[in-house]
Each structure stands twice: as structure tokens, then as C-alpha cells.
Amino acid sequence: EVEKTACPSGKKAREIDESLIFYKKWELEACVDAALLATQMDRVNAIPFTYEQLDVLKHKLDELYPQGYPESVIQHLGYLFLKMSPEDIRKWNVTSLETLKALLEVNKGHEMSPQVATLIDRFVKGRGQLDKDTLDTLTAFYPGYLCSLSPEELSSVPPSSIWAVRPQDLDTCDPRQLDVLYPKARLAFQNMNGSEYFVKIQSFLGGAPTEDLKALSQQNVSMDLATFMKLRTDAVLPLTVAEVQKLLGPHVEGLKAEERHRPVRDWILRQRQDDLDTLGLGLQGGIPNGYLVLDLSMQEALS
């Protein structure tokens, strides 16, 4: 911490300008009025203060606003935001999307830091839900943002916000997250026609149940193998060979290359070999002809 010393004659800052770059830390502490700094925060980012000088400026703001900075200051923090700790940020009340954007811009190109995560958490909690504009903004800066949320947090996403989600935003989502997002997407896109609907719903299908996959198989959607491989294994297993063939269309030939990987491997084990042979792909591992298949899960349910 910079010790308190009187400001030298003629060095009292009348405004935040470039001359301050050449002040020593103690001079900044002694000669820059915290209230002046707060009212001219928009200038700070345009001045190439050193890392150490930014520490002094932060200290001055902390003294002026011990309960947390007002949004008028937060919006103009610029690179000073990188000096904030999660504890500092928890004191803030950020309500403006413009403020959020301004701070995310500072961190652009870097991974999500603890500061950013805290800022987003504060912002979303303040809004009560992850609305479309917020989601638009967050996924623009952090394509993996949606997949960093827990299923519980995702449950607060209104279906209308799903329109803001791009396929790449879901790249790192696990099945539990897609289980939450898929019904919302289904609801959001329900009024679209077949082919348009499939284009939009495709990246969410990792959360789709068997009955929805069966319905899609009747719509000539030609699902690609990459999408098929991301489907829930338990949703794929009950599909018949005919249904999978219809679901994949011309892409069905890709099953051969994936026959050793889930869910294709597990699905093959559940199909009759003679049914698999009808595909003409040389898929092996199905149930031999003449064998009886007992669905024990169904038997347990009946008893």
C-alpha cells in the first residue's frame, strides 16, 4: 500500500489525463482526488497506466466506495476491471447489459476468469432469469458459456432465449445439460415446419427421448452421423433398423465406420442380425436368427 504523503506543489490533478502516467505511485495516491477519478473513469482506459498505477487507482476507488462501486463507475472500469477480485464484484449491483458488455470486452480473447464468472452470476441473479439478450451477449463472448451452467441453472432459461443459442454454444454440453435444454428448444421451435424445425433442433437432440427420434424418422430429415453419435444411448436403443435407416437417410452408410462406438455398438447388439443385414453394410454383432429376446425391464415393470 502506498503511504500517505502530501501532494507536491503544482502536481494536484485537475483532470484525469496523460500527465498522470509519469506520476509515481505515491504521487497518484496524494494528488488524484478519488471523486475526480470516479467522475472521469471513462478517461482511465484511454491512458496507458502501468499495472502498479492501476493498483493505486483501484485503492482510491475502494476507499471512496467501501460498499461497492456504483454502476456509473463500473461501466467505465475498462482494464481496471482485471484488477477486481470476485469479492469486490460481489458487492456490485450490475443491471445494465451495456455495463456487462463493456466489462466482457476487456476480457475478450481470454478464458472466463473467476472475476467474469462472478460478474455474470451477479448479473443473471439480478435479472432473475437468463433472458435472450443476456444469453446473446454471453454466448457471443463465451461460446461455451451455456455448457458451464449446471442443469439447475439452465432450468431458469426461458424457451424464448433458446433462439439465441448457436450450435457451437452447445459443443461442450453433457447429456444432463441437454436433457434440460432439449424440451425448451422443442417448445421454442414448435411452430416451425419440418425441415426448418430439424435445422434448429438438431444441436439439442442429445437430450431427445426415443419417441421424438421415432417421430423425426418419419420426416425424411437425413440426420448426419455426428448428430446421431451424440444422441442418448438409452434413446437410440429402442429404435428399429427401419427407423434408424429413415432417420439417417443417405448417411446410414456411416454406421459401418462407427460400429465399435456408442451408441451404434450398443444399438447393434439389440437388433436382429437379419434386420441389420437388410442395410447391406456388413454390420455384425446383432442377435442371431432363432434367438428369443426377453425385455427384462418390461417384465419387471409388469410384475
Epitope: 502536481k11 509519469f22 504521487e27 496507458p48 497506466f49 502501468t50 499495472y51
Partner: antibody
């Protein structure tokens, strides 16, 4: 050991532009501001401006605004100065210099880059 | 801009002699910095914050002053001290350098 290595001498025609580099090593590049200084033949030193590698912020001597453009490449810890619309008045030795902690002088200097502007 | 005027412009000294050169500022400044430059070489920081010796600088060098008047002293001149010496300030924006004092060996 701190080292500032500048690019070699340049001979350019009037009206052209030139970009001088200053590759640093031996310290954390983003923790110190980099300054550029001009020394005309047999003359004193003139401060051109500075760049803060931490955030890319710049500050220029009014006299060199529009003449010099300062940039950095953090990945290679290198500072650059581009000089535009060159005239014979720009012929000089140009130095990059690191500003010491808490404004304690220009503590390390590059070896200098000689620029000759001639047709 | 703050103008720094160095005097004398040229001086000479014998080995072992005490040498003092001055730097006068057109307005009051907080700190002065001194650099040594030999022909064909880059400037080298000698004194920072008016009176502090930079790393590796011999103790025969010292700096003093305040306000508008500053000086650099070499307690005992040595052959290797023959060079041009520049004062510099950045108390006022933009930073400026003096015109230099050329010190020659007698």
C-alpha cells in the same frame, strides 16, 4: 538478464514507411511500459511515445502524433514502432527503452536502429 | 513542454578531478534522471529520482537538486567517464531531455 534487441539499419526513400522492432527478453513484458526515443545525428534525445504492453494503451508526444504508431505483440514480447510518410528530417537513430518500476528512469535500452531517409 | 538547459555544453577534466554539471528546468519538477552516452552506444541510466544510483553505477557518481536546479557530480574523474551526459524529466508531460554536456578527458 534483461535484453532489448532492435532490428537492423534501414535505408528508405522519402514518402515511404518503415517498421522497427524491439524484441525483449529476461523480464515479464507486460509489467513495464516501452518507450521510443529519437536521436538525430549529433543531437540530443527526444521522447516519441510509450506503449503499455499490458493493455496496448499508447501515449504520444504531440510532435510525433501521426508520424509514429506504436504496437506490441505479446506472444513474442516484441514492441514495434512504425514511422510514416518519411522525410529527411526523420533520419536518426531510434531507441526503444524500458521504463523502470514506478517511473525510475529508462533502465534498459535497445542498441538503436539507424534510419536513413534518402532518395 | 519543460525545457531542460544543461551547462556547460562541453567540459574537460583531468583524471582524479571532481566534475560537476548542471541542469536547469524551465519550471519546477519533482525528480531528475541522468544518463551517460558514449559514441556509438545507447544511453545508460546513471541516476534516478534525483539522487539514487542505478544498478551497476560506480559510487563516484552522485546527483542532487530540487525545484528547477539539479546537478550531477563525479567525485574523481576517470578515463572511462568521458562521454555525453543527459538530464531528463517526466514530472511534466511530455518527458524531455536536456541538450547534453560533453565531458572530455584532459
Amino acid at each position: 538478464e534483461v535484453h532489448l534487441q532492435q532490428s537492423g539499419p534501414e535505408l528508405v526513400k522519402p514518402g515511404a514507411s518503415v517498421k522497427i522492432s524491439c524484441k525483449t527478453s529476461g523480464y515479464t513484458f507486460t509489467e513495464y511500459t516501452m518507450h521510443w526515443v529519437k536521436q538525430s545525428h549529433g543531437k540530443s534525445l527526444e521522447w516519441i511515445g510509450l506503449i503499455n504492453p499490458y493493455n496496448g494503451g499508447t501515449s504520444y508526444n504531440q510532435k510525433f502524433k501521426g508520424k509514429a504508431t506504436l504496437t506490441v505483440d505479446k506472444s513474442s514480447s516484441t514492441a514495434y514502432m512504425e514511422l510514416l510518410s518519411l522525410t529527411s528530417e526523420d533520419s536518426a537513430v531510434y531507441y526503444c527503452a524500458r521504463r523502470g518500476y514506478d517511473n525510475e528512469g529508462f533502465d534498459y535500452w535497445g542498441q538503436g536502429t539507424t534510419l536513413t531517409v534518402s532518395s | 513542454d519543460v525545457v531542460l538547459t544543461q551547462s556547460p555544453a562541453i567540459m574537460s577534466a583531468s583524471p582524479g578531478e571532481k566534475v560537476t554539471m548542471t541542469c536547469s528546468a524551465s519550471s519546477s519538477i519533482s525528480y531528475m534522471y541522468w544518463y551517460q552516452q558514449k559514441p556509438g552506444s545507447s544511453p545508460r541510466l546513471l541516476i534516478y529520482d534525483t539522487s539514487n544510483l542505478a544498478s551497476g553505477v560506480p559510487v563516484r557518481f552522485s546527483g542532487s537538486g530540487s525545484g528547477t536546479s539539479y546537478s550531477l557530480t563525479i567525485s574523481r574523474m576517470e578515463a572511462e567517464d568521458a562521454a555525453t551526459y543527459y538530464c531528463q524529466q517526466w514530472s511534466s508531460y511530455p518527458p524531455t531531455f536536456g541538450g547534453g554536456t560533453k565531458l572530455e578527458m584532459k
